[in-house]
């Protein structure tokens, strides 16, 4: 019951997180004009990953897309890439986790497969959340650097009579949305991984019983069957089972690269 709740909650938290990552990526307010030097501006500038906007006090807002790809800063391209990777991984993770949910029955899917899928989606959510947090943090760092550079320029270039107020940008709402959303996706992913660990022992115990049952029945059957099964003495049988169990644990704890394809 607790495992189902943990898995369900992990799914919901990740879903909210990924929705937030998508929202942050689409938002125009990644950086907003710093109004410290000019709090009474009649023109307000803000920028996103895809376009920059100007809102006039008249109520008119004009947005212009970044129609160039090569002319954009490498950092901006990197942030875009991180956010998109985060969204893609998160979306795949959501798809996988829907089928992995314990409360949903799909055909004759075994619990071991559900455990694998839960872990896979959990890892995907963790990576997705990290991508979003990294993307937002890189952008924030870029803003801080530019902010102090423009502040330095502002106070060194005041020699003339005419004031040229340089537009400085500070953190926009999208950054906070991105950080929170990334964190939620990360937490959701961790919860999915915890849920998977909760699923794994149940499966192992179940298999252990089945193996023991077949092992005992073999002891009473003719030798020909024994030979055909490939099991030797009881010790040999146990060793093979242990090995099988260990391999299965490894699959659950450390998915192979094929699990992501």
């Amino acid at each position: 019951m607790a495992v189902t709740a943990c898995q369900g909650l992990g799914f919901v938290v990740s879903l909210i997180g990924i929705a937030g990552i998508i929202a942050a990526t689409c938002m125009d307010q990644w950086s907003t004009q710093d109004l410290y030097n000019n709090p009474v501006t009649a023109v307000f500038n803000y920028q996103g990953l895809w376009r920059s906007c100007v809102r006039e006090s008249s109520g008119f807002t004009e947005c212009r897309g970044y129609f160039t790809l090569l002319g954009l800063p490498a950092m901006l391209q990197a942030v875009r890439a991180l956010m998109i990777v985060g969204i893609v991984l998160g979306a795949i993770g959501l798809l996988v986790s829907i089928f992995a949910l314990k409360c949903i029955r799909i055909g004759s899917m075994e619990d071991s497969a559900k455990a694998n899928m839960t872990l896979t989606s959990g890892i995907m959510f963790i990576v997705s959340g990290l991508c979003a947090i990294a993307g937002v943090s890189v952008f924030a760092n870029m803003l801080v650097t530019n902010f102090w550079m423009s502040t330095a320029n502002m106070y060194t270039g005041m020699g003339g009579m005419v004031q040229t107020v340089q537009t400085r940008y500070t953190f926009g709402a999208a950054l906070f949305v991105g950080w929170v959303a990334g964190g939620l996706t990360l937490i959701g992913g961790v919860m999915m991984c915890i849920a998977c660990r909760g699923l794994a022992p149940e499966e192992t115990n179940y298999k252990a019983v089945s193996y023991h049952a077949s092992g005992h029945s073999v002891a009473y059957k003719p030798g020909g069957f024994k030979a055909s099964t490939g099991f030797g003495s009881n010790t040999k049988n146990k060793k093979i089972y242990d090995g099988g169990a260990r391999t299965e644990d490894e699959v659950q704890s450390y998915p192979s690269k094929h699990d992501y394809v």
């Epitope: 023109v43 006039e56 006090s57």
Partner: antibody, heavy 119, light 113 residues
């Protein structure tokens, strides 16, 4: 057609008060910022105050700050300018105007209402 | 506050002549965000209310004759009337619409000989 009609002007004693109104029609009043601009006799234009569409931002010229209060009633499509502690230099024609256009430009202006501050 | 200085204060021209008037700002009115200058030009004919001529320093309002041209950037702006007509007799004001208070210039009075 956009129409702005000012009212409430007249003769006021120095130190007195007056409330000007501007009735708007022909556009979605609640969506646009509104301004008051005045013009003293034989003088140039002087911007007085601005109020945003939802009254979230209100700005005043330094010459009227603390004496004039700008407000609006969106359901009634009306703009108000409450003037107190009036001085002789406040004598002017008061226009209400709207930033209906791009570039914060004041495209539509009322015909103005005359305020005379004199003893 | 942004101070706008208009020159000359008055101009006397003959019909058909080309005329230019200047408006200088104490601060830059150029907005980096959209690469536009937030300066507006108005025309006020005798006994009438002001009317909008040009916004964003150089964009003519629809319906304004193309003989009116706005130019300049940053702190220096110019309004040019290519062939002055009798109906252009008016006072021309420039206005800062970049930051509050939205100051006006003192105006340039255009007279005909």
């Amino acid at each position: 057609d956009v129409q702005l009609v000012e009212s409430g002007g007249g003769l006021v004693q120095p130190g007195g008060s007056r409330k000007l109104s501007c009735a708007a029609s022909g556009f979605t009043f609640s969506s646009f910022g509104m301004h008051w601009v005045r013009q003293a006799p034989e003088k140039g234009l002087e911007w007085v105050a601005y109020i945003s569409s939802g009254s979230g931002s209100i700005y005043y010229a330094d010459t009227v700050k603390g004496r004039f209060t700008l407000s609006r009633d969106n359901p009634k499509n009306t703009l108000f300018l409450q003037m107190t502690s009036l001085r002789s230099e406040d004598t002017a024609i008061y226009y209400c105007a709207t930033s209906y256009y791009y570039g914060n430009a004041l495209e539509y202006w009322g015909q103005g209402t005359s305020v005379t501050v004199s003893s | 506050d942004v101070v706008l200085t208009q020159s000359p204060s008055s101009l006397t021209v003959t019909e058909g002549e080309k005329v230019s008037m200047s408006c200088k700002s104490s601060q830059s009115l150029f907005n980096v965000g959209n690469q536009k200058n937030y300066l507006t030009w108005y025309q006020q004919k005798p006994g009438q209310t002001p009317t909008l001529l040009i916004y964003w320093a150089s964009t003519r309002k629809s319906g304004v004759p193309d003989r009116f041209t706005g130019s300049g950037s940053g702190t220096d702006f110019t309004l040019t009337i290519n062939t002055v007509q009798a109906e252009d007799l008016a006072v021309y004001y420039c206005q800062n619409v970049y930051s509050y208070p939205l100051t006006f210039g003192a105006g340039t009075k255009l007279d005909l000989k």
